[in-house]
């Protein structure tokens, strides 16, 4: 039951995380105009990975897409790539984890196969989360660098008569959404990997049970396989549960808040 809960919770946490990564990637507020020097600006600038926007005091908002690929900074391209890789891996991980869920039965899928799929999706979630965190962090670092560079030459002009205030940008909401979402996806992935350890019954420690074959006896001793050997485990062994055999009806999934997924 604990394994099912851990797996289900890991799936939901990852699902929320990946939804957050997608949201962050699509958001326009990756960087927002720093209002320190002009808190009552009538024109507010903010930028995303795909377009830059200007919101006027009048309420009018205009957004322009970055219609060039080669003209964009390499760092921005790298951030885009990291976020897309994170989304793709996360989406594949979600697809795999749906079939891996203990509460969902697909034909006569072995528990060991589900364990393998759970581990695979868990690793995908971890990598997805790391990609998102890396992408957001690279962008944040780029912002910090540019912020101090623009602060160094904040005012330029002719003899101080005419001032041209350079627009500085600071962290936008998307960065925080990305960090939290990446962290959630990472946590979800770790939970899936933990759930994998207890999924396959033949990979658990059982008490000594005798199996009488014709001619000689074979005894299965305690000291099960390590969880890390989830791939390629012996699936031909009969499943022997401690505390007596359990009927198929007794091994059931209980309705929970995660059943809508």
């Amino acid at each position: 039951m604990a394994v099912t809960a851990c797996q289900g919770l890991g799936f939901v946490v990852s699902l929320i995380g990946i939804a957050g990564i997608i949201a962050a990637t699509c958001m326009d507020q990756w960087s927002t105009q720093d209002l320190y020097n002009n808190p009552v600006t009538a024109v507010f600038n903010y930028q995303g990975l795909w377009r830059s926007c200007v919101r006027e005091s009048s309420g009018f908002t205009e957004c322009r897409g970055y219609f060039t690929l080669l003209g964009l900074p390499a760092m921005l391209q790298a951030v885009r790539a990291l976020m897309i890789v994170g989304i793709v891996l996360g989406a594949i991980g979600l697809l795999v984890s749906i079939f891996a869920l203990k509460c969902i039965r697909i034909g006569s899928m072995e528990d060991s196969a589900k364990a393998n799929m759970t581990l695979t999706s868990g690793i995908m979630f971890i990598v997805s989360g790391l990609c998102a965190i890396a992408g957001v962090s690279v962008f944040a670092n780029m912002l910090v660098t540019n912020f101090w560079m623009s602060t160094a030459n904040m005012y330029t002009g002719m003899g101080g008569m005419v001032q041209t205030v350079q627009t500085r940008y600071t962290f936008g909401a998307a960065l925080f959404v990305g960090w939290v979402a990446g962290g959630l996806t990472l946590i979800g992935g770790v939970m899936m990997c933990i759930a994998c350890r207890g999924l396959a019954p033949e990979e658990t420690n059982y008490k000594a049970v005798s199996y009488h074959a014709s001619g000689h006896s074979v005894a299965y001793k305690p000291g099960g396989f390590k969880a890390s050997t989830g791939f390629g485990s012996n699936t031909k062994n009969k499943k022997i549960y401690d505390g007596g055999a359990r009927t198929e009806d007794e091994v059931q999934s209980y309705p929970s808040k995660h059943d809508y997924v």
Epitope: V43, V54, E56, S57, G59, F60, V162, V165
Partner: antibody, heavy 118, light 113 residues
Framework: EVQLLESGGGLVQPGGSLRLSCAAS????????MSWVRQAPGKGLEWVAT????????YYADSVKGRFTISRDNSKNTLYLQMNSLRAEDTAVYYC???????????WGQGTLVTVSS | DIVMTQSPDSLAVSLGERATINCKSS????????????LTWYQQKPGQPPKLLIY???TRESGVPDRFSGSGSGTDFTLTISSLQAEDVAVYYC?????????FGQGTKLEIK
């Protein structure tokens, strides 16, 4: 047709109070940022205050900050300017305006005259 | 605050001739986000409220005759009336729409010579 109609102007003594109203029609009032602009007799234009649509952020000219309050009632399609501690230099025609692209004021009312005198 | 300075204070031009009004701001009105200049031109005829002519320094408001044009960037702007008509007699104001407080120029009175 967009219409802005100011009212509430008149003669008031220094230190007194007055509340100007601007009835808007012909457009979705709640969607627009609105402003008050004044013009002293024979002088130029002076921006007084602005109130944004939605969450209603307010901005004021230094000369009226702390004395004037801009507000709006979207259910009544009305813009207000509460003027307290009035001074002789506040004597002017007060215009109600609507903001558009570029923060430009595309529609202006006919104005209401406020005279501060003892 | 951004100070707006118009020149000349008054201008007399013959009918059909070109009229040019200048406006200078103490700070740049160019927004780097959209490369637009937040400067607006208004026309005020005697006894009437001002009328919007041009916003974003060069975008003509709908219904404004095409003889009116705006140009300039950063801190220096110009309103041009290519062929002066009798109905163009008015006071013209430029305005900073870039940052609060919004500030107007002192106005330029345009008359017929």
């Amino acid at each position: 047709e967009v219409q802005l109609l100011e009212s509430g102007g008149g003669l008031v003594q220094p230190g007194g109070s007055l509340r100007l109203s601007c009835a808007a029609s012909g457009f979705t009032f709640s969607s627009y940022t609105m402003s008050w602009v004044r013009q002293a007799p024979g002088k130029g234009l002076e921006w007084v205050a602005t109130i944004s649509s939605g969450v209603s952020y307010t901005y004021y000219a230094d000369s009226v900050k702390g004395r004037f309050t801009i507000s709006r009632d979207n259910s009544k399609n009305t813009l207000y300017l509460q003027m307290n501690s009035l001074r002789a230099e506040d004597t002017a025609v007060y215009y109600c305006t609507r903001l558009t692209k570029g923060n430009a004021m595309d529609y202006w009312g006919q104005g209401t005259l406020v005279t501060v005198s003892s | 605050d951004i100070v707006m300075t118009q020149s000349p204070d008054s201008l007399a031009v013959s009918l059909g001739e070109r009229a040019t009004i200048n406006c200078k701001s103490s700070q740049s009105l160019l927004n780097s986000g959209n490369q637009k200049n937040y400067l607006t031109w208004y026309q005020q005829k005697p006894g009437q409220p001002p009328k919007l002519l041009i916003y974003w320094a060069s975008t003509r408001e709908s219904g404004v005759p095409d003889r009116f044009s705006g140009s300039g960037s950063g801190t220096d702007f110009t309103l041009t009336i290519s062929s002066l008509q009798a109905e163009d007699v008015a006071v013209y104001y430029c305005q900073n729409d870039y940052s609060y407080p919004f500030t107007f120029g002192q106005g330029t009175k345009l008359e017929i010579k």
